[in-house]
């Protein structure tokens, strides 16, 4: 006999990197009948939702209006069908950005490279953190770690084509707790013809939506959300 | 911006009963979540029981079957009806809100609400 059901799927809209003070929703997807979900929170209960009505109802959304570091961290999602509760979900890591200070980013040997050239960024924050994190615009959402007192190099090695698009930075105060993003940079890679077509830049979005941090698209969020919960726990583990 | 008022504390026998009042300013009270939480002296504070925006409740445990949680929009008010109250009970009172949310929404936990009232404090004893 079943004991649990299956784990729900959790994910945040628009992104899970959420600028403090800014709104974000939690989403949670079950199954359709589920009478209650519960969203939890570091290992504490954070809010219950009741869809109505349930056997019509496959996901419920939790909102957060004000986004600040008490709320950044993990969370987990739960549901109920009958008296039967469900196996939790992967956890969700929220981090909140636009903490305290703005990192510097510079690329050496310069912004212009030809294909095969050693390229390595450089992260620079002031304040005390020793973390960086490098983080490629697009739906890839490439992220890398760096480490140092004030500053963190991000060798990408030998580029390709494939490397072309916009950077930022962010210092980390905590596996939660970012700085604001950096200016971006954008890497320009030449390479010759063949190389270009077959490794098109990574779409991606204008500087003025970045402050969203809408590194993926929301359809490709309800997609694959398991690509979503594994890109999440990638990017903070 | 919220402002949120409360009222109905005071001194009371075990076995009692109050009631507490949160009053609202704006007219954001109906897209609101609200929420009642407790700090006993020397004690962290603590969830007491919660509402969303379409009356769905929550109670902490040890308040079950004896605080009941409502709300009247129309007068932009949440009320905590306590009975059966004990010396356990005695901490200042403070009403919360989640504004905005969904209207399923119940929170729980006292970092989700961006509104607090100032307290009113409800003394338990002989």
């Known amino acids: 006999q079943q004991q649990t059901l299956p784990k729900p799927f959790i994910w945040a809209e628009p992104h899970f990197m959420v600028p403090k003070e800014k709104q974000v929703t939690i989403c949670c997807q079950g199954n359709y009948g589920a009478v209650e979900y519960q969203l939890h929170f570091e290992g504490s209960l954070f809010a219950v939702d009741r869809p109505k009505p349930p056997e019509r109802i496959n996901k419920v959304k939790f909102y957060i209006p004000d986004m600040n570091s008490r709320m950044a961290g993990q969370y987990s999602c739960i549901y109920r069908v009958g008296e039967l509760w469900s196996e939790p979900s992967n956890l969700l890591d929220l981090v909140v950005t636009e903490m305290y200070d703005t990192p510097t980013l510079s690329v050496h040997p310069g912004p212009e490279v030809i294909s095969g050239e050693k390229v390595t960024f450089y992260c620079r924050l002031d304040t005390a953190t020793s973390m960086f994190l490098l983080l490629k615009e697009g739906r890839s959402s490439h992220v890398q770690r760096g480490y140092g007192k004030v500053q963190a190099e991000f060798p990408l090695g030998p580029v390709t084509t494939a490397h072309r698009g916009t950077y930022r930075c962010f210092g980390s105060y905590n596996n939660h707790a970012w700085s604001f993003p950096s200016e971006p940079v954008k890497l320009l890679v030449t390479g010759d013809i063949e190389n270009t077509s077959l490794a098109p830049e990574d779409p991606t979005f204008p500087a003025d939506t970045w402050g969203t941090y809408l590194l993926t698209t929301e359809t490709g969020l309800q997609k694959d959300h398991a690509l979503w919960d594994h890109t999440a726990q990638n990017l903070l583990r | 911006e919220v402002q949120l008022v409360e009222s109905g504390g005071g001194e009371v026998q075990p076995g009692g009963s109050l009631r507490l009042s949160c009053a609202a300013s704006?007219?954001?009270?109906?897209?609101?979540?609200m929420g009642w939480f407790r700090q006993a002296p020397g004690k962290e504070r603590e969830f007491v029981a919660a509402i969303s925006r379409s009356d769905d409740t929550y109670y902490a445990d040890s308040v079950k079957g004896r605080f009941t949680i409502s709300r009247d929009n129309a007068k932009n008010t949440v009320y905590l009806q306590m009975s059966s109250l004990r010396a356990e009970d005695t901490a200042v009172y403070y009403c919360a809100a989640v504004v905005p949310t969904y209207g399923n929404n119940i929170y729980v936990h006292s970092a989700a609400y961006n509104y607090w009232g100032q307290g009113t404090l409800v003394t338990v004893k002989p």
């Open positions: 704006g007219r954001t009270f109906a897209s609101a979540a």
